[in-house]
């Protein structure tokens, strides 16, 4: 959860007008040291912050992407990095700032007039593209709202889960992403023990459905760490 990285996140937000603790994440009882900034103008936010650890783009803000901070760095150490502006180099759509997408390794403007054909090419030709850029406000809203009338069915190529029909999620399959079924109660799920570990999966499972969480199967508690089976279980 977010609390696990609070201590490494050095944003210091000032107390809110209602006098409570920082609203997201944390509370009066769980805010980590350094989150609240004492004194001063309460409507000022100090924006010099340390990088936020992440495992995938979806954990970062809409103007960020998740990657190793150093070229060729350890895949397990990833942080949220500022998105790349137009004409900067990229490897996938999520790296480009809102209003842009990744075309032939360069962030280009997502001009609606020629975007449809290009994005369809890019989905099929790119390595691990995670998100498209469709408008100036949010590059990670659904593809279907702009270009497709129907949501992707099981096996359809997708960029993110909102491209898929209800009950499906967008998950990695070899080096592209396709719509796969959201996991049901009792189905085996993947619990990532360390940040960044699911960047290595080439057959990614969906997450557990609503009301379910990925937990160790009760009769596997005695098994060794490496062989523990996780299944989707009711909260």
């Amino acid at each position: 959860t977010l609390n696990s990285v609070l201590n490494s996140n050095a944003i210091k937000n000032l107390p809110p007008p209602l006098g409570g603790a920082a609203g997201h994440p944390g509370s009066a009882v769980s805010a980590a040291p350094g989150i609240l900034y004492p004194g001063g103008n309460k409507y000022q936010t100090i924006d010099n912050y340390q990088p936020y650890p992440c495992a995938e783009d979806e954990e970062c803000g809409t103007d960020e992407y998740c990657a190793s901070p150093t070229r060729g760095g350890d895949a397990g150490v990833q942080i949220c990095l500022a998105c790349r502006k137009r004409r900067k180099r990229c490897m996938r759509h999520a790296m480009c700032c809102p209003g842009n997408y990744c075309k032939n390794g360069i962030c280009v403007s997502s001009d609606q007039n020629h975007f449809r054909g290009e994005i369809e090419e890019t989905i099929t030709e790119s390595f691990g593209n995670d998100h498209s850029t469709l408008d100036g406000y949010s590059r990670r809203t659904t593809l279907s709202s702009k270009m497709y009338h129907t949501k992707g069915q099981e096996g359809s190529v997708c960029l993110r889960s909102s491209d898929c029909a209800s009950g499906l999620c967008c998950a990695r399959h070899f080096w592209s992403k396709i719509c796969k079924p959201v996991l049901k109660e009792g189905q085996v799920c993947t619990k990532h023990r360390r940040k960044g570990s699911h960047g290595l999966e080439i057959f990614q499972r969906c997450y557990c459905g609503e009301g379910l969480s990925c937990r160790i199967q009760k009769d596997h508690h005695q098994a060794s760490n490496s062989s523990r089976l996780h299944t989707c279980q009711r909260h």
């Epitope: 937000n13 920082a22 944390g26 936010t45 912050y49 803000g61 406000y137 809203t141």
Partner: nanobody, 125 residues
Framework: EVQLVESGGGLVQAGGSLRLSCTAS????????VGWFRQAPGKEREFVTA????????DYADSVKGRFTISRDNAKNTAYLQMSSLKPEDTAVYYC??????????????????WGQGTQVTVSS
């Protein structure tokens, strides 16, 4: 501009469950952090839980961890708060709020720029 409307509140016995919904109008919802706050009579409004734009990051106040679950469906422009094992001290007006999620960081309460009108949750003993 995002308008938020909460629903699903009501009267429930201690130990029971409720599911609150927060339905948004406006395209900015899918790019927003969504948070739930609550305010009990005579008390300050307090943070309950929050979820980032994609649903990949969530956080909970210690008082509700393990009992409450936040989720969202961007296709339906809706966020949910599943509340179980309810206690009398959970009685409050529950507010849904949304704010910009451009950067992965902590939001203070005043940075939630859109707020719903609230829905009453009463837990009887």
């Amino acid at each position: 501009e995002v308008q938020l409307v909460e629903s699903g509140g009501g009267l429930v016995q201690a130990g029971g469950s409720l599911r609150l919904s927060c339905t948004a109008s406006g395209s900015a919802f899918s790019s927003s952090v969504v948070g739930w706050f609550r305010q009990a009579p005579g008390k300050e409004r307090e943070f309950v839980t929050a979820i980032n734009w994609s649903g990949a990051r969530t956080d909970y106040a210690d008082s509700v961890k393990g009992r409450f679950t936040i989720s969202r469906d961007n296709a339906k422009n809706t966020a949910y708060l599943q509340m179980s094992s309810l206690k009398p001290e959970d009685t409050a007006v529950y507010y849904c709020a949304a704010g910009s999620d451009r950067y992965a960081r902590v939001l203070t309460e005043y940075e939630y720029v859109w707020w719903g009108q609230g829905t009453q949750v009463t837990v009887s003993s």
